[in-house]
């Protein structure tokens, strides 16, 4: 851009800054000529420690540039983010954070397994940490669900002691009435509709506990809830079809062996779920003693035919449709195995051989007046039924 | 012309988190420059908090940087302040200013009482 | 952290006089420092850049200079107006670091 003002003196040579250039090159520079300094991919602008995104000076009057030079250095992307549940490892060298530069990041071994793109990130130019997905974001330490110390299946009312570790993902619920849930993730529990109904306006009054054996015990990690979720196609008092609700909580659970949650159903979970599979109820429902139990206690129960707890609820005084499609039942012909009062909203979880994790099949729901009757059944809320429900309240939630 | 507006709370209680917006009218944060906020204390020392760049990359005084957190809206060509767990050594005056402080907006005050 | 010292707190001057303000950084920042106005209830006005470079719109009775740790704030014919109290800060590196204010004041 030449404008001859042979009046005016010319301006110093622009001396391109190291990693930059110089636009356009002249042979000499007068009054009103500019030149713009174009920086190596991988560096930037810089005036000190102030990003600028372009650069152009112009040549005055007095032979002098109006914008000092500014350097060109090279893109710092800065320390990462840290992880929840997880750790970053420096990959290019100790503390390395320029341009290229290559991260690692990883979760807490057994109890967290990463989500979205596998934790290696790259100093890029535009200086943001990039997966090579492309993602800006961090990468998610997911807690691993379904661990348990129980390897198998199969072999409460009628029910055994639970030892540590055996139902990781056994919550108390106390606030109103004495009730259970199961963790999801970190900080989500599911549970039955009807037991935290009265409290679905008032989250916070709920009490939760969970990483302990003993009701009682003094020794458990507390967490308080945000909000309720309460199926809208359930109807307090009238039936117990769509018996299921979600409790967000208000801050994330760290994962151990004695807190871990339990999976949701895959699609294939049918398979592990047909009449005679065996299922695992835990809670500190009431004993056959009529008691509520002072340590967990587990049930391991065959899947019911549909058709014949269908009918063995269709007597007085159960209305008709007591059993819906939305409902699983368990327990034995002859009785002696249940859950009961107390034990409501806690999970029925079956193994899936293939993963060897165990999963939620059913929520304690209802069942006869008189736990552990025979030709009469437990019955479940059949949360493969609801999977798309709870999938849509988590991502929104 | 450009201008930048600051606007908040005016009282917040110990430990509760502050939000600050910087609203800039006559030129778009993401154009260029850095866009900091400064806090001034009453006896007129003054401070720099950090910076949002034009690209979105931001930088933070260490002293705050585990409880700052500097975001933007591009389309209402705002940028915010966060700062977690406040205590009464946050009572201070907060601006917002573009690069090394060409244009500063008027500032808002902030009391941090219980 | 790069400190900025402004060792006078306090500069009386009159009107026509011409007052240097000086600043001294703790390391070495370059020409990255910057000056600024500020009058009571008022935000604060950038006046030079760069150590030497005027802001537009500045009197040109404004001057500044320096490198490296030592700067200085030159007002050659002081105006009423030019009472007020003036900041160095330094923008070479992170944290960016206010000097602690001198304040000019008429004798």
């Known amino acids: 851009h030449h404008h001859h003002h042979h009046a005016s003196q010319p301006c110093p040579y622009p001396m391109a800054p190291p990693n930059g250039h110089v636009s356009p090159v002249q042979a000499k520079y007068i009054l009103k000529d500019s030149f713009s300094i174009f920086c190596e991919t991988g560096y930037e602008l810089l005036q000190g420690h102030l990003p600028l995104k372009s650069f152009t000076a112009v040549c005055q009057k007095d032979g002098s540039w109006d914008r000092p030079m500014p350097a060109c250095s090279i893109v710092d992307c800065g320390p990462p983010d840290d992880l929840p549940s997880g750790r970053v490892e420096y990959i290019t060298g100790p503390g390395v954070t320029t341009y290229k530069a290559v991260i690692q990041y990883s979760c807490e071994e057994t109890f967290y397994t990463m989500k979205v793109n596998d934790g290696k990130y790259v100093c890029e130019a535009d200086g943001f940490w990039t997966s090579s997905k492309g993602e800006k974001s961090l990468p998610v330490c997911e807690p691993v669900c379904g661990l348990s110390a129980r390897t198998t299946g199969g072999r409460i009312y009628g029910g055994q002691k639970a030892k540590p570790g055996d139902f990781p993902w056994q919550v108390l619920i106390l606030g109103g009435t004495t009730a259970a849930g199961a963790l999801l993730y970190d900080n989500w529990v599911l549970t039955a509709a009807h037991a935290v109904y009265e409290q679905k306006h008032d989250a916070s009054a709920l009490d939760i506990r969970m990483g302990t054996l003993k009701r009682l015990s003094p020794h458990y990690t507390q967490a308080w809830s945000e909000a309720v979720f309460i199926h809208e196609g359930y109807t307090h008092d009238a039936g117990f079809d769509n018996d299921i609700a979600l409790i967000k909580l208000n801050n994330k659970v760290v994962i151990n062996s004695n807190i871990t949650p339990i999976c949701l159903p895959r699609k294939e979970a049918e398979s592990f779920m047909r009449t005679d599979d065996i299922g695992t109820a835990s809670g500190w429902g009431l004993t056959q003693r009529g008691f509520l139990a002072r340590n967990l206690m587990y049930v391991d129960i065959p899947i019911v035919d549909h058709q014949k707890c269908t009918a063995a609820y269709e007597k007085p005084p159960y209305p008709r449709g007591s059993v819906t499609a939305n409902m699983l039942c368990a327990g034995l012909e002859s009785g002696g195995k249940d859950s009961c009062r107390g034990d409501a909203g806690g999970a029925l979880v079956f193994l899936d051989s293939e993963t060897e994790r165990w999963f939620v099949g059913g929520i304690v729901s209802w069942g006869s007046m008189n736990c552990g009757e025979a030709g009469q059944y437990g019955v479940y809320t059949k949360v493969i039924n609801y999977i798309p429900w709870i999938e849509n309240i988590i991502s929104d939630f | 012309d450009v201008q930048l507006q600051e606007s908040g709370p005016g009282l917040v209680k110990p430990s509760q988190s502050l939000s600050l917006t910087c609203t800039v009218t006559?030129?778009?944060?993401?154009?260029?420059?850095?866009w900091n906020w400064i806090r001034q204390f009453s006896g007129d020392k003054l401070e720099w908090m950090g910076y949002?760049?034009?690209?979105?990359?931001?930088s933070y005084n260490p002293s705050l940087k585990s409880r700052i957190s500097i975001t933007r809206d591009t389309s209402k060509n705002q940028f915010f302040l966060h700062l977690s767990s406040v205590t009464t050594e946050d009572t201070a005056t907060y601006f917002c200013?573009?690069?090394?402080?060409?244009?500063w907006g008027h500032g808002t005050t902030l009391t941090v009482s219980s | 952290d790069s400190v900025m010292t402004q060792s006078q707190k306090f500069m009386s001057t009159s009107v026509g006089d011409r007052v240097s303000v000086t600043c001294k950084a703790s390391?070495?920042?370059?020409?990255?420092v910057a000056w600024f106005q500020q009058k009571p209830g008022q935000s604060p006005k950038g006046l030079i850049y760069?150590?030497?470079y005027r802001s537009s719109g500045v009197p040109d009775r404004f001057t500044g200079s320096g490198s490296g740790t030592d700067f200085t704030l030159t007002i050659s014919n002081v105006q009423s107006e030019d009472l007020a109290e003036y900041f160095c800060?330094?923008?070479?590196?992170?944290?960016?670091?206010f000097g602690g204010g001198t304040k000019l004041e008429v004798k």
């Open positions: 390391h070495n920042v370059g020409t990255n």
């Open positions: 200013a573009r690069y090394w402080g060409d244009y």
């Open positions: 949002i760049s034009y690209s979105g990359s931001t």
């Open positions: 800060l330094q923008y070479n590196s992170n944290p960016l670091t």
């Open positions: 006559g030129y778009s944060i993401t154009s260029d420059y850095a």
């Open positions: 760069s150590a030497s």
